[in-house]
């Protein structure tokens, strides 16, 4: 049975040219996390493996930084970065947990962080 929950930074917004931290946290389980994948729609951004550490996809390595923790920092944001981001926790024995974050990149300086929410 999968007892864990993923808490994410939820719906967030940031200014064009700025940076943002995408953060997920797996709680309520002692399952072993073997790997966390960060994906944007169908594109793999980065992988954090328990044994091997971080791997950033070559096409994103200029604008993506690992951390903090299992999170991901996106830099030099463009309007094209607007969209859904997924943190995918591969664990055993539980299996796979997925968290969703929606990022909106704004032209103006009215960007605000949304509320945190949980995905079971």
């Amino acid at each position: 049975m999968m007892t864990g929950t993923i808490e994410t930074t939820g719906n967030i917004s940031a200014e064009k040219g700025g940076s943002i931290i995408l953060q997920c946290h797996l709680s309520s389980t002692t399952a072993q996390v073997t790997q966390v994948n960060w994906e944007q729609q169908d594109q793999l951004l980065a992988i954090c493996n328990a044994d091997l550490g971080w791997h950033i996809s070559p096409s994103f390595k200029d604008r993506v930084a690992p951390g903090p923790g299992l999170g991901l920092t996106l830099q030099s944001l463009t309007v094209n970065d607007t969209g859904e981001y997924f943190c995918i926790y591969h664990t055993y024995p539980d299996g796979t947990y997925t968290g969703r974050i929606f990022l909106e990149v704004l032209e103006s300086s009215v960007a605000e962080h949304g509320a945190r929410f949980q995905i079971p």
Epitope: T3, V33, D51, Y92, P93
Partner: antibody
Framework: EVQLVESGGGLVQPGGSLRLSCAAS????????MSWVRQAPGKGLELVAE????????YYPDTVKGRFTISRDNSKNTLYLQMNSLRAEDTAVYYC???????????WGQGTLVTVSS | DVVMTQSPLSLPVTPGEPASISCRSS???????????LEWYLQKPGQSPKLLIY???NRFSGVPDRFSGSGSGTDFTLKISRVEAEDVGVYYC?????????FGGGTKVEIK
């Protein structure tokens, strides 16, 4: 090389407390769920506590729930087991263990003996 | 709770001969993910337990190929194709498909 070294065992009176430590090296400690397993003299193995890699989630069987507390300090690569209200039946060798490769106890420490007796 | 029952309790063996240990669970230990998290450990006299087999049939690194695991659902077996003197000790099965995670009572293997 993965190394787990337990310490803190000893003789304690019934009702007393003890804190065990497990010093980890040779791997990224903060990436792993960790466990304590005990073995009473001449008996089998029993899982007594687990803690997630971040320390945010824990698990205890009913036999120790409310008396034992597992914790970790990822900055010191150290796992702890705080044992309160100890009973004679808690007398055992206590091992810390780490998962790996899809196994739950891939690596074990050498164990530390806890004796609860008056 | 899932009860893990091992048999026999004691197994006298002759070096060079095969040996087999059974482990039965009180309910299926196939996890929702489809994996069966059944492991075998050997505890030699005066030592910590050591992992032999994980996920029913996978040998852990450094484990000799004379050890093999098999089974499914509720019925599992550890086989030693040719017992060596160094194989003496207590063998435990363990499941972590379900909480609480549980060990079998152990099977003591000794040389005849």
């Amino acid at each position: 090389e993965v190394q787990l070294v337990e310490s803190g065992g000893g003789l304690v009176q019934p009702g007393g407390s003890l804190r065990l430590s497990c010093a980890a090296s040779g791997f990224t400690f903060s990436s792993y769920t960790m466990s304590w397993v005990r073995q009473a003299p001449g008996k089998g193995l029993e899982l007594v506590a687990e803690i997630s890699s971040s320390g945010g989630s824990t698990y205890y069987p009913d036999t120790v729930k409310g008396r034992f507390t597992i914790s970790r300090d990822n900055s010191k690569n150290t796992l702890y087991l705080q044992m309160n209200s100890l009973r004679a039946e808690d007398t055992a060798v206590y091992y810390c263990a780490r998962p790996g490769l899809g196994a739950w106890f891939a690596y074990w420490g050498q164990g530390t003996l806890v004796t609860v007796s008056s | 709770d899932v009860v893990m029952t091992q048999s026999p309790l004691s197994l006298p063996v002759t070096p060079g001969e095969p040996a087999s240990i059974s482990c039965r669970s009180s309910q299926s230990i196939v996890h929702n993910s489809g994996n069966t998290y059944l492991e075998w450990y050997l505890q030699k006299p005066g030592q910590s337990p050591k992992l032999l087999i994980y996920k029913v049939s996978n040998r852990f690194s450094g484990v000799p190929d004379r050890f093999s695991g098999s089974g499914s659902g509720t019925d599992f077996t550890l086989k030693i194709s040719r017992v060596e003197a160094e194989d003496v000790g207590v063998y435990y099965c363990f499941q972590f498909s379900h909480v609480p995670r549980t060990f079998g009572g152990g099977t003591k293997v000794e040389i005849k």
